[in-house]
Interface confidence: medium
């Protein structure tokens, strides 16, 4: 269950300010002495971190991935888990910490000196839980080793947003992922609905840039739910 995971060091989310004031995305977050999780009669410490629920890896931090906290992958909520370091087991790239990727079920360094020429990678994106794959849409993609030494430019194949240059994010494009521009003010964005999964977006957009959020365009309020246009707007 999630309770047992919370008692380990697996959950690595920033602690809340005990003062209780709502913070700002850029503000510092003060450390709490410990968050406790009520588990029956016994209280369990979470080592200063709280579980952060997620639906996909992009909702987590750069050093995290989204998965069920239990081995069996129960039907409950998925949370952001700390990324796996080198030589740890993995099932997909996002599970491995930046600078590593998943090869043959193990996180390996993606910037080793002996890398020459090209490496072949199977990019399998996970939807729903840790053990699901894209129903056979596993695409073999050739990645240049240069990708691991310099930040990817627009159109470069990537594994995660940290592989991309500033102003770009790693987003799905067909069955692969490439660096795409972070959305600017006024650009159309995708607003996922809380009910139901995010679905399969084969042409995924980046998120809105800092200081922007994805909202219904003012003149589209009267439109039907399904046809409402969302754009990146100032907070």
């Amino acid at each position: 269950t999630l309770n047992s995971v919370l008692n380990s060091n697996a959950i690595k989310n920033l602690p809340p300010p005990l003062g209780g004031a709502a913070g700002h995305p850029g503000s510092a977050v003060s450390a709490a002495p410990g968050i406790l999780y009520p588990g029956g009669n016994k209280y369990q410490t979470i080592d200063n971190y709280q579980p952060y629920p997620c639906a996909e890896d992009e909702e987590c931090g750069t050093d995290e991935y989204c998965a069920s906290p239990t081995r069996g992958g129960d039907a409950g909520v998925q949370i952001c888990l700390a990324c796996r370091k080198r030589r740890k087991r993995c099932m997909r790239h996002a599970m491995c910490c930046p600078g590593n990727y998943c090869k043959n079920g193990i996180c390996v360094s993606s910037d080793q000196n002996h890398f020459r020429g090209e490496i072949e990678e199977t990019i399998t994106e996970s939807f729903g839980n840790d053990h699901s794959t894209l129903d056979g849409y596993s695409r073999r993609t050739t990645l240049s080793s240069k990708m691991y030494h310099t930040k990817g430019q627009e159109g470069s194949v990537c594994l995660r947003s940290s592989d991309c240059a500033s102003g770009l994010c790693c987003a799905r494009h067909f069955w692969s992922k490439i660096c795409k521009p972070v959305l600017k003010e006024g650009q159309v964005c995708t607003k996922h609905r809380r009910k139901g999964s995010h679905g399969l977006e084969i042409f995924q957009r980046c998120y809105c840039g800092e200081g922007l959020s994805c909202r219904i365009q003012k003149d589209h309020h009267q439109a039907s739910n399904s046809s409402r246009l969302h754009t990146c707007q100032r907070h």
Epitope: P25, S162, K191, H192
Partner: nanobody, 123 residues
Framework: EVQLVESGGGLVQPGGSLRLSCAAS????????MGWFRQAPGKERELVAL???????HYADSVKGRFTISADNSKNTAYLQMNSLKPEDTAVYYC?????????????????WGQGTLVTVSS
């Protein structure tokens, strides 16, 4: 700036019910996870319930079957329906909204916090 305002707290008798609300502004509500935490006097803050952006929910063992977390995207509001309240549920209840992780370049996904609303269960 992200703002979260909780309401609905108060004094209730054991076995009674309360519905807490958390109005959010300054974030794309439906794309972020929400959580309810609580802090009893002299104790640490603890997790009560979570709801992910895809609607999946999770509850602390001590509140399972009694509390229900939900979210109304059209009102940018999260709720915590609390039934069969017990004296040990007495605490300040805090609403928390995830503000996204790698979207802002954070290495860890993080929460924004409301000021809290007091719930007292006593006869």
């Amino acid at each position: 700036e992200v703002q979260l305002v909780e309401s609905g707290g108060g004094l209730v008798q054991p076995g009674g019910s309360l519905r807490l609300s958390c109005a959010a502004s300054g974030l794309t509500f439906s794309t972020y996870p929400m959580g309810w935490f609580r802090q009893a006097p002299g104790k640490e803050r603890e997790l009560v319930a979570l709801i992910a952006s895809n609607g999946n929910t999770h509850y602390a063992d001590s509140v399972k079957g009694r509390f229900t977390i939900s979210a109304d995207n059209s009102k940018n509001t999260a709720y915590l329906q609390m039934n069969s309240l017990k004296p040990e549920d007495t605490a300040v209840y805090y609403c928390a909204a995830g503000n996204g992780g790698r979207a802002y370049g954070y290495s860890r996904a993080r929460y924004e916090w409301g000021q809290g609303t007091l719930v007292t269960v006593s006869s």
